[in-house]
C-alpha cells in the first residue's frame, strides 16, 4: 500500500496535473497538454520529474521553479518559448534531463544553462537556432547527449563543443551545415554516435573527424558530398557508417583501411561508377555489401580479410570473370 509520505506528496499535485510517486519517495508530475500558459505555482519541493510539454508557455521568468532541488527531469518541449532568461533553472542542482525541443528558440540559452553541472541530456532540436555561442556549454561537464537537429545552423559550432569531453551522442542533423572543418570535434573523445544527416555538407576537412577516438556510428546520409569521405580513416572504432544519398562517384583503394570494426556501410543512392579493388579488404565484421550500378568495375573486388560477408550484391558492373579464390574468401 501507499505510505503516509506518498499521501503528503500527492497533496502537492498541481490542479489538473497527473502525479504519482517515483518509488524513491519523490514525485513524478505530468502537466503535459493542458493548455497552460504559465508554470504551475504549487509544485511540491519533492518533485523529481516535471512534464510541461505541449502547452502554451511562451516565457519563463527568472527562478520560476524555486527550491526544486530534487528535480531530475524537466520537459518543456512543444511550447512557444522564444527566449529563456538567465536564472530560469536556478537551484535545479539535480537536473539531469532538460527537454526544450519544438519551441521557437533562436539562440542556445547560454546564461540559463550555466552551472547545470548534473545535466546529462539536453534537447534543443526543432527550434530556430542559427547561432551557438562559443562558451554556451562550458559549465555542462556531465553532458552525455546533445540534440541540435532540425535547427538553422549553417556551420559546426566548433568552439562550443570543446568543453563537452564527456559527450557520448550528438545529432546535428537537419540543419544547413555546408562544411566540416578540421578538428571540428577535436575534444569529443567520448563521442560514440554522431548524426550529420540531412544537411548540405559538400566538403570535409581532411582531419575533420580527428579526435573522435570512440566513435562507433557516423551518419552522413542525405548530404551533398561529391568525394568519398577519406577523413573517416582515423575512426578506428567505427562500426556503422552511412553516406547514402550523396553525390559520390568513386570509392577509392583502401577506402576503409582505418575502420576494421565496420559492421554496416550504407552508400546506396550515390552515382558510384568506380570502386577500388582493395576498397573492402580487411573488414572482418562486415556482413552486407551492396554495389549497384558501379559501371566501371571490371574486376571482382578483393575481399581478403573480409571473411564474414553474408550478402554480396553486385549489379551493373563490367566483371567478366570471377577469381578462383572467391569461394574461399566468403563463408
Amino acid at each position: 500500500g501507499s505510505s503516509p509520505r506518498s499521501g503528503v506528496l500527492l497533496r502537492g499535485c498541481p490542479t489538473h496535473c497527473h502525479c504519482e510517486p517515483d518509488g524513491r519517495m519523490l514525485l513524478r508530475v505530468d502537466c503535459s497538454d493542458l493548455g497552460l500558459s504559465e508554470l504551475p505555482s504549487n509544485l511540491s519541493v519533492f518533485t523529481s520529474y516535471l512534464d510541461l510539454s505541449m502547452n502554451n508557455i511562451s516565457q519563463l521568468l527568472p527562478n520560476p521553479l524555486p527550491s526544486l532541488r530534487f528535480l531530475e527531469e524537466l520537459r518543456l518541449a512543444g511550447n512557444a518559448l522564444t527566449y529563456i532568461p538567465k536564472g530560469a533553472f536556478t537551484g535545479l542542482y539535480s537536473l539531469k534531463v532538460l527537454m526544450l525541443q519544438n519551441n521557437q528558440l533562436r539562440h542556445v540559452p547560454t546564461e540559463a544553462l550555466q552551472n547545470l553541472r548534473s545535466l546529462q541530456s539536453l534537447r534543443l532540436d526543432a527550434n530556430h537556432i542559427s547561432y551557438v555561442p562559443p562558451s554556451c556549454f562550458s559549465g555542462l561537464h556531465s553532458l552525455r547527449h546533445l540534440w541540435l537537429d532540425d535547427n538553422a545552423l549553417t556551420e559546426i559550432p566548433v568552439q562550443a563543443f570543446r568543453s563537452l569531453s564527456a559527450l557520448q551522442a550528438m545529432t546535428l542533423a537537419l540543419n544547413k551545415i555546408h562544411h566540416i572543418p578540421d578538428y571540428a570535434f577535436g575534444n569529443l573523445s567520448s563521442l560514440v554516435v554522431l548524426h550529420l544527416h540531412n544537411n548540405r555538407i559538400h566538403s570535409l576537412g581532411k582531419k575533420c573527424f580527428d579526435g573522435l577516438h570512440s566513435l562507433e556510428t557516423l551518419d552522413l546520409n542525405y548530404n551533398n558530398l561529391d568525394e568519398f569521405p577519406t577523413a573517416i580513416r582515423t575512426l578506428s572504432n567505427l562500426k556503422e557508417l552511412g553516406f547514402h544519398s550523396n553525390n559520390i562517384r568513386s570509392i577509392p583503394e583502401k577506402a576503409f583501411v582505418g575502420n576494421p570494426s565496420l559492421i554496416t556501410i550504407h552508400f546506396y543512392d550515390n552515382p558510384i561508377q568506380f570502386v577500388g579493388r582493395s576498397a573492402f579488404q580487411h573488414l572482418p565484421e562486415l556482413r552486407t555489401l551492396t554495389l549497384n550500378g558501379a559501371s566501371q568495375i571490371t574486376e571482382f573486388p578483393d575481399l581478403t580479410g573480409t571473411a564474414n560477408l553474408e550478402s554480396l550484391t553486385l549489379t551493373g558492373a563490367q566483371i567478366s570473370s570471377l577469381p578462383q579464390t572467391v569461394c574461399n574468401q566468403l563463408p
Epitope: I156, Q159, R233, S236, G258
Partner: antibody
Framework: EVQLVQSGAEVKKPGASVKVSCKAS????????IEWVRQAPGQGLEWIGE????????DYNEKFKVRATFTSDTSTSTVYLELSSLRSEDTAVYYC???????????WGQGTLVTVSS | DIVMTQSPDSLAVSLGERATINCRAS??????????MHWYQQKPGQPPKLLIY???NLESGVPDRFSGSGSRTDFTLTISSLQAEDVAVYYC?????????FGQGTKVEIK
C-alpha cells in the same frame, strides 16, 4: 604508454638516400597522424610533412615534396621517412611525432641524426 | 607560408620571476574560433615537449606555472615563476595551414 622509437644514426654521402624508421606503440596506430620534423645543428625546427599510417594519406612540405617519401607498415606499427638526393644541408636530427590534440605534436621520437658528408 | 616570429631571441630571468615569450604569425591562425598555435619546450639533447595546445590549453602533466594566451596573430607563453628546470629553448608552432611552421625559438636562461 605511448612511445615512438626511431632508428639509429646514419652517415651518408651526398647524392645518397636515407630511410629513417619510427616504431609506434601504446595507442591505435592508424588513428593518429605521424609528423616528421627536422632540426639542423644549432638551428630551429622544420616541418617535413605527415602521414596517416595504413592509408595513402600524406602531406609534404613543398620544399621536400620531390625528395621525401613517407610509408607505413601497419603489421609492425612503423612509419618510414625516406629522403633522397642527400646534400650536406640535410645534416640534421630527424624527429617523428604524433599529431595529437588539434594537431599539436604530443609525443616525439628520440630523434635520428643523419650526417651527410663526403 | 606563414612566418612565425618569436621575441625575444633570448631571455634571462631570475628564479621565481615571470618569463614572457611572444610569438607573432604573419597571418591569422584562427579558424572557427580555435587558434591553431602550440608551444613546445626543448632541452639540450632532447626532443621538444608539448606544453600548450590551441594557444591556451595546458597539456596534461605540464606544471600550471606555464600558461598561454592570444589569438589571431599575437600569442604569448608565460612562465609565472621560473624554476631551474625551465631553462630551455621554447618554440611556437602553427598548424593552421600547410606547411606547418615554427618560430625560430627563444632561449630562456637564469639571471
Amino acid at each position: 604508454e605511448v612511445q615512438l622509437v626511431q632508428s639509429g644514426a646514419e652517415v651518408k654521402k651526398p647524392g645518397a638516400s636515407v630511410k629513417v624508421s619510427c616504431k609506434a606503440s601504446g595507442y591505435t596506430f592508424s588513428a593518429y597522424w605521424i609528423e616528421w620534423v627536422r632540426q639542423a645543428p644549432g638551428q630551429g625546427l622544420e616541418w617535413i610533412g605527415e602521414i596517416l599510417p595504413g592509408s595513402d594519406s600524406t602531406d609534404y612540405n613543398e620544399k621536400f615534396k620531390v625528395r621525401a617519401t613517407f610509408t607505413s607498415d601497419t603489421s609492425t606499427s612503423t612509419v618510414y621517412l625516406e629522403l633522397s638526393s642527400l646534400r650536406s644541408e640535410d645534416t640534421a636530427v630527424y624527429y617523428c611525432a604524433r599529431g595529437g590534440h588539434y594537431g599539436s605534436l604530443d609525443y616525439w621520437g628520440q630523434g635520428t641524426l643523419v650526417t651527410v658528408s663526403s | 607560408d606563414i612566418v612565425m616570429t618569436q621575441s625575444p631571441d633570448s631571455l634571462a630571468v631570475s628564479l621565481g620571476e615571470r618569463a614572457t615569450i611572444n610569438c607573432r604569425a604573419s597571418e591569422s591562425v584562427d579558424n572557427y574560433g580555435n587558434s591553431f598555435m602550440h608551444w613546445y619546450q626543448q632541452k639540450p639533447g632532447q626532443p621538444p615537449k608539448l606544453l600548450i595546445y590551441l594557444a591556451s590549453n595546458l597539456e596534461s602533466g605540464v606544471p600550471d606555472r606555464f600558461s598561454g594566451s592570444g589569438s589571431r596573430t599575437d600569442f604569448t607563453l608565460t612562465i609565472s615563476s621560473l624554476q631551474a628546470e625551465d631553462v630551455a629553448v621554447y618554440y611556437c608552432q602553427q598548424n593552421y595551414e600547410d606547411p606547418f611552421t615554427f618560430g625560430q625559438g627563444t632561449k630562456v636562461e637564469i639571471k
